[in-house]
């Protein structure tokens, strides 16, 4: 997945940290304060969506197939440019209780983005 | 230290309608949801739904859906219930509770509420 | 929706007595989202009880809670005299969120 660098409007991944100060959930979330959760941003034009390295499947790049030939339904939907790779953290955080809880939490951080 | 504060008691005719507000201090206001729960004189607790103060979308009980809007005005911290087309059975008192509501981190119960608004519906 | 039933309607007690509330809901609770409140008459629930058996900040020793997917218990293991009120549980893990229709512990 690509880097956006300012220099290409491709589907690509944007650095984005998010500070939990921010959202109102410091008071409880002990650690870490923040993070990069990045997000996706770009256009996904026809020859690159489903292309290897940036599809989200080997159902996008079939799907891509007959939208490229203008096959109906197909013909009218438009490739999204959507998080392909997703990591966990480890968060600290405090129950209802005031209990300290250590949970690896799924899906927190975008790795690669990619064309749906 | 966490306190909700809620508007005083009403007293409506049948027919009209009801806005009750709860004041949110002593933490970040837009980092929990704020629902509302109704208690008639004598009975058990009703929950009416819920608002995210951070978006403002709503989740309301079906019973309620159409008469029931509930809104948050993040600049004073304080969340709105109001209550449209009164009958008398709709004497309660109101509830404002706030509550974590976060899947991957664990859902919370409604660990703080406010003290309560007597509405009465009387013609 | 999911409904909780509770039982009995009312528990006559002793101070110093074991009270034992039970909750029964319609369908599982998902991920043991539930709670117990404690409610006096013209005050504001009290959470006693959530995650099914953890205790709130501040709450004694002597109330606990049990149980997961549709059966759960609250136990006060001794009553004091302020333990006599209503005792009502909620599910939190789906919407609409939904309460019991409440015990009431008095003195016998």
């Known amino acids: 997945g690509l880097e956006c660098d300012g220099k290409v409007n491709i589907c690509c991944k944007k650095q984005f940290f998010v500070s939990f100060k921010d959202i109102g959930w410091n008071d409880w979330i002990i650690a870490p304060s923040g993070y990069h959760a990045n997000y996706c941003e770009g256009e996904c034009p026809s020859h690159i969506a489903g292309t290897s390295g940036s599809s989200l499947s080997f159902h996008s790049t079939v799907i891509n197939h007959y939208r490229m030939r203008g096959h109906s339904p197909f013909a009218n939907l438009k490739s999204c440019c959507v998080p392909t790779k997703l990591r966990p953290m480890s968060m600290l955080y405090y129950d209802d209780g005031q209990n300290i809880i250590k949970k690896d939490i799924q899906n927190m951080i975008v790795e690669e983005c990619g064309c749906s | 230290q966490v306190q909700l504060v809620q508007s005083g008691a009403e007293v409506k005719k049948p027919g009209a309608s009801v806005k009750v507000s709860c004041k949110a201090s002593?933490?970040?206001?837009?980092?929990?949801?704020m629902h509302w729960v109704r208690q008639a004189p004598g009975q058990g607790l009703e929950w009416m739904g819920v608002?995210?103060?951070?978006?403002?979308?709503?989740n309301y009980a079906q019973k309620f859906q159409g008469r029931v809007t509930m809104t948050r005005d993040t600049s004073i911290s304080t969340a709105y219930m109001e209550l449209s087309r009164l009958r008398s059975d709709d004497t309660a008192v109101y509830y404002c509770?706030?509550?974590?509501?976060?899947?991957?981190?664990?859902?919370?119960?409604?660990?703080?509420w406010g003290q309560g608004t007597l509405v009465t519906v009387s013609s | 929706e999911i409904v909780l039933t509770q039982s009995p309607g009312t528990l006559s007690l002793s101070p110093g007595e074991r009270a034992t509330l039970s909750c029964r809901a319609s369908q599982s609770v998902s991920s043991s989202y539930l709670a117990w409140y404690q409610q006096k008459p013209g005050q504001a629930p009290r959470l006693l009880i959530y995650?099914?058996?953890s205790r709130a900040t501040g709450i004694p020793d002597r109330f606990s809670g049990s149980g997961s997917g549709t059966d759960f218990t609250l136990t006060i293991s001794r009553l004091e005299p302020e333990d006599f009120a209503v005792y009502y549980c909620l599910q939190y893990g789906s919407y609409p969120r939904t309460f019991g229709g409440g015990t009431k512990v008095e003195i016998k």
């Open positions: 002593g933490y970040t206001f837009f980092g929990y949801s």
């Open positions: 608002i995210n103060p951070s978006s403002g979308d709503t």
């Open positions: 995650g099914a058996s």
């Open positions: 509770a706030r509550a974590r509501d976060i899947a991957a981190l664990g859902l919370g119960a409604f660990d703080y």
